[in-house]
């Protein structure tokens, strides 16, 4: 399977909420035995791999942001933790999953990384990560809501979030 | 804060079951991989095995016709049980929180454990 | 199951001097190796995970490199309280492994 992060750059005004995402693409093995661990965390463009450091937002850590659950089951965070932080993680039935930050600042700006984890019990993990970068804008020059910018693969055609 | 604390008799006669608890406070046990880990005296760290929070194990397979790991999700406990144990199981046996896809982060204080008649 | 080999077995050195620990693994791990730091009557602490992320907490004279076979853990100036022993931990399949062991007693 792989992650496909449907955009690359979100450009967002500060106090604007913005939801990142990430989809779980290719076959996707529901048995007993296999779990999906997915989470985020801030990152930088490494030299040796992107998405490898793994920094928290807004001080909550992976750990805490993590969803767990089997194939597509739907899953989210219902920690007190990540809301009081303005924070909330989800996942669908489709292999879409998310992270939506509240109230943003200009300290949000950065490298942001979905992960997820096949653990094939018995077996072994397999990891896959995709990145996207948030730019938060302030002053006359900002967006008046987010506008997001789909990654390469994709149309490059600028898309105004709802 | 996550904190895990072993607990379990410091002396177990050979070809009994050695039986260890862990309780996991301060956070949930209800997600990770949740694994036990030995030193022996004077030593390096073996990894035992794991149980998932679902209750999925995996062994070390050196280990694996002896070991039984098991996990009471409303307990915030998981327990690790060793039969037929010998001389060669004396050891400080340590559970500790293994993260998908990182590492272990969080370790109990550990607790010896000696096997003799 | 994958073998690390740590080296050397003890390493002598002063406080303040530069420590170079090497970590070899029988097959590839890619980049899924931890390394921790383990004082007598202690439980280990984590250092670094994926071969060169410092854990949280963990001061910038520690440092990891390698991927594959080969890895190094650095400790650029050694301080007092950095006279442990070293495990590096594979996490690439299982069973889980560690190395081991290095020792870095004060000269």
């Known amino acids: 399977f792989k992650v496909a992060t449907p955009y690359s750059l979100y450009v967002c005004p500060e106090g604007q909420n913005v939801t990142l995402t990430c989809r779980l693409l290719g076959p996707v093995d529901k048995g007993h035995d296999v779990t999906f661990y997915k989470t985020w965390y801030r990152s930088s463009r490494g030299e040796v791999q992107t998405c490898s450091e793994r920094r928290p937002i807004r001080n909550l850590t992976f750990q805490d942001l993590h969803l767990h659950h089997g194939g597509h089951q739907a899953a989210n965070t219902s920690h007190d933790l990540a809301q009081r932080h303005g924070l909330e993680s989800a996942s669908d039935h489709h292999g879409n999953f998310s992270i939506t930050m509240r109230n943003l600042t200009l300290l949000d700006s950065g490298l942001y990384c979905c992960l997820v984890v096949e653990i094939r019990h018995h077996h072994s993990e397999h990891r896959v990560h995709g990145a996207m970068e948030l730019q938060v804008q302030t002053g006359k020059d900002a967006p008046s809501n987010c506008v997001v910018y789909p990654s390469s693969s994709q149309d490059s055609e600028n898309i105004t979030a709802a | 804060q996550v904190q895990l604390q072993e607990s379990g008799p410091g002396l177990v006669k050979p070809s009994e079951t050695l039986s260890l608890t862990c309780t996991v406070s301060?956070?949930?046990?209800?997600?990770?991989?949740w694994s036990w880990i030995r030193q022996p005296p004077g030593k390096g760290l073996e990894w035992i095995g794991h149980i998932y929070y679902s209750g999925s194990t995996n062994y070390n397979p050196s280990l694996k016709s002896r070991v039984t790991i098991s996990v009471d999700t409303s307990k915030s406990q998981f327990s690790l049980k060793l039969s037929s144990v010998t001389a060669a199981d004396t050891a400080v046996y340590y559970c500790?929180?293994?993260?998908?896809?990182?590492?272990?982060?969080?370790w109990g204080q550990g607790t010896m454990v000696i096997v003799s008649s | 199951e994958i073998v690390l080999t740590q080296s050397p077995a003890t390493l002598s050195l002063s406080p303040g001097e530069r420590a170079t620990l090497s970590c070899r693994a029988s097959?590839?791990?890619?980049?899924?190796l931890a390394w921790y730091q383990q004082k007598p009557g202690q439980a280990p602490r984590l250092l670094i995970y994926d071969a060169f992320n410092r854990a949280t907490g963990i001061p910038a004279r520690f440092s990891g490199s390698g991927s594959g076979t080969d890895f190094t853990l650095t400790i650029s100036s050694l301080e007092p309280e950095d006279f442990a022993v070293y495990y590096c931990q594979q996490r690439i399949n299982w069973p889980l492994t560690f190395g081991g062991g290095t020792k870095v007693e004060i000269k």
């Open positions: 500790a929180r293994d993260i998908p896809a990182f590492a272990f982060d969080i």
């Open positions: 097959q590839s791990v890619s980049y899924y």
């Open positions: 301060g956070g949930s046990i209800s997600s990770y991989y």
